[in-house]
């Protein structure tokens, strides 16, 4: 009798362990995304970045999945995204198209069951970046909390992407999930 | 054996209860510290601020530790990192050498056991604050999804300090866990 | 005996069940409120917004209560709060009363209990918004982590609230629970 | 390497007037927060006014408060230094200095904040 109880909380004890550890790690997947500059398109106009690291410095994913420069959900979840986005020139990359600026960036949702994209969050500036100043930065840094389903996909696109910061701690963006949908 | 068996559920539900409060409250360590306008550094290019509050006002911490100007990771984890930064300029406040100024926050991340110091993340910009002008403002906020390990230190890296808004809404910078490393 | 036995556990796992789905559920309030730009007040000073969306587009309310243009705290805990504000003018809105302008947030705590409101959050910047450029466009971000109270209510004050970007990626705040209050 | 080359001094009688200029060749003067210092015999020198990079932001000690005005022309690179009401304990050897690295407030500003420093210009009032 006694050995069958113990064997028993055994299994309430295993059981429940096994419940809490997979609740607690399966259900917080993450990313922090940080640019890769050897792929930035040219161009002043609204333009989607797809070249980010995923595993390399201050990058890394779990339990979700980078693929065509968009992060693609795997969990149903209500998720904490962010992005920050720096911008820069010096007058050594030579003379600027035009000093007035529009520095943007958009986190973008795509649905592949319906075919569709929706910005989620967006920020900026409009800049006068002059020929006086040698050197020209600005960063932008947008969060926000959103309810993601499984194969949803998010992704950046940002205005003047050559002007971008290529440094893992300047250009990066991310997710992290914080609660289930009910 | 009846008895025997309440006192082995008693038992269960005691361990459970005891695991639940532990890996909730002690998985969670967090820190909002505040800026100690009291003892800011003069400079122009990238100046460690060392004088924070951790237990007045807004600012608070646990399960971290403030220390030498540095927030210690006491707990291995992945934490939310952020930080807000607000400079400001009144024309009662006296002359400014330079109208041509470089507003950025490195918040960095030092090793002890590997004496290292890297940016986790950067923001700021370039402005022009001229005399014409009685008042000028300008604030950078950043934030990010870090891996942390204990003994880790997280400090904050500023240009033009005496340019710092004192107010405890301004300029603070904190972090939370998140979740466990796997 | 044997029969009682599993009673006993199935009486201990279901209360565990009920125990974790309760404190995961219930411990995770969460908004995100998304600007309502049919009642958007004029002038250039410190004014409160209170009209917002909480449940359409991306807005979105859990254990929290929207009334009165402030978000009210149902449950004690700590709570990772953000603010997304989004200015902008084209020319063909008119003149500017004044092309230097002070593009402001700030995020305060109003405690019914003790009348009192206390800025938890501000950031901004000062712009020289010249007649020379069509489009003029900057955005705040800011966020911190506070302790909140149950009855504790969280509203957004902007200076220049005309010239507010009245889009639902753009102009948003938000909060969710990340832990109790030990 | 940058020259500073100071000229306008000489002698006046006291509550007349000097216009000092300071014209810089050799660097980007227009990046350079620039300074007058001036050195009575026997005496230290003294810092006697600044202007910022872009002329906006000027700085006087309390002695030279509202007769003394600094002023900068960045396409000449050249800043001067209009001296009015002159008075005998102005007498002295005037510096121009400049700053190549600008940051902070002009009022903190020291001689050993100031990295180009020019050969200096006789002031002398007396009746």
């Known amino acids: 009798g006694s050995q069958h109880i113990r064997a028993e909380k055994a299994m309430v004890d295993g059981s429940w362990l096994d419940l809490a550890k997979r609740s607690k790690l399966e259900a917080q997947p993450f990313a922090h995304l940080t640019i890769n500059a050897t792929d930035i398109p040219s161009g002043s106009h609204k333009v989607s970045l797809s070249s980010w690291y995923h595993d390399r410095g201050w990058a890394k994913i779990s339990n979700m999945t980078f693929s065509n420069g968009k992060l693609i959900v795997n969990q149903d979840g209500f998720y904490y995204l962010y992005a920050n986005i720096c911008f820069r020139h010096h007058e050594t990359s030579g003379d600027l198209a035009t000093e007035y600026l529009q520095l943007m960036v958009y986190v973008t949702k795509t649905s592949i069951k319906i075919p569709s994209s929706h910005t989620l969050m967006k920020g900026g500036s409009t800049k006068y970046w002059s020929g006086n100043s040698e050197f020209h930065f600005y960063s932008i840094n947008v969060g926000g909390f959103f309810k993601l389903r499984s194969g949803e996909e998010i992704s950046i696109e940002v205005s003047n992407p050559s002007l971008l910061d290529p440094d893992q701690d300047a250009t990066y963006f991310g997710a992290f999930k914080v609660r289930d949908i009910d | 054996g009846s008895q025997h068996i309440r006192a082995e559920k008693a038992m269960v539900d005691g361990s459970w209860l005891d695991l639940a409060k532990r890996s909730k409250l002690e998985a969670q360590p967090f820190a909002h510290l505040t800026i100690n306008a009291t003892d800011i550094p003069s400079g122009s290019h990238k100046v460690s601020l060392s004088s924070w509050y951790h237990d007045r006002g807004w600012a608070k911490i646990s399960n971290m530790t403030f220390s030498n100007g540095k927030l210690i990771v006491n707990q291995d984890g992945f934490y939310y990192l952020y930080a807000n930064i607000c400079f400001r300029h009144h024309e009662t406040s006296g002359d400014l050498a330079t109208e041509y100024l470089q507003l950025m926050v490195y918040v960095t991340k030092t090793s002890i056991k590997i004496p290292s110091s890297h940016t986790l993340m950067k923001g700021g910009s370039t402005k022009y604050w001229s005399g014409n002008s009685e008042f000028h403002f300008y604030s950078i906020n950043v934030g990010g999804f870090f891996k942390l390990r204990s003994g880790e230190e997280i400090s904050i890296e500023v240009s033009n300090p005496s340019l710092l808004d004192p107010d405890q809404d301004a300029t603070y910078f904190g972090a939370f866990k998140v979740r466990d490393i796997d | 005996g044997s029969q009682h036995i599993r009673a006993e556990k199935a009486m201990v796992d279901g209360s565990w069940l009920d125990l974790a789905k309760r404190s995961k559920l219930e411990a995770q309030p969460f908004a995100h409120l998304t600007i309502n730009a049919t009642d958007i007040p004029s002038g250039s000073h410190k004014v409160s917004l209170s009209s917002w969306y909480h449940d359409r587009g991306w807005a979105k309310i859990s254990n929290m209560t929207f009334s009165n243009g402030k978000l009210i705290v149902n449950q004690d805990g700590f709570y990772y709060l953000y603010a997304n504000i989004c200015f902008r003018h084209h020319e063909t809105s008119g003149d500017l009363a004044t092309e230097y302008l002070q593009l402001m947030v700030y995020v305060t705590k109003t405690s019914i209990k003790i009348p009192s409101s206390h800025t938890l959050m501000k950031g901004g910047s000062t712009k020289y918004w010249s007649g020379n450029s069509e489009f003029h466009f900057y955005s705040i971000n800011v966020g911190g982590f506070f302790k909140l109270r149950s009855g504790e209510e969280i509203s957004i004050e902007v200076s220049n609230p005309s010239l507010l970007d009245p889009d639902q990626d753009a102009t948003y705040f938000g909060a969710f629970k990340v832990r109790d209050i030990d | 390497e940058v020259q500073l080359v100071e000229s306008g001094g000489g002698s006046v009688q006291p509550g007349g007037s000097l216009r000092l200029s300071c014209a810089a060749s050799g660097g980007t003067f227009s990046r350079y927060a620039m300074g007058w210092f001036r050195q009575a015999p026997g005496k230290e020198r003294e810092f006697v006014s600044a202007?910022?990079?872009?002329?906006?932001?000027?700085y006087y000690v309390d002695s030279v408060k509202g007769r003394f005005t600094i002023s900068r022309d960045n396409a000449e690179s050249t800043v001067y230094l209009q001296m009015n009401s002159l008075k005998p304990e102005d007498t002295a050897v005037y510096y121009c200095?400049?700053?190549?690295?600008?940051?902070?407030?002009?009022?903190?500003?020291?001689?050993?904040?100031?990295?180009?420093w020019g050969q200096g210009t006789q002031v002398t009032v007396s009746s």
């Open positions: 200095a400049g700053d190549a690295s600008p940051y902070g407030y002009l009022r903190e500003y020291t001689a050993t904040r100031f990295d180009y």
């Open positions: 202007i910022s990079v872009g002329g906006t932001y000027q």
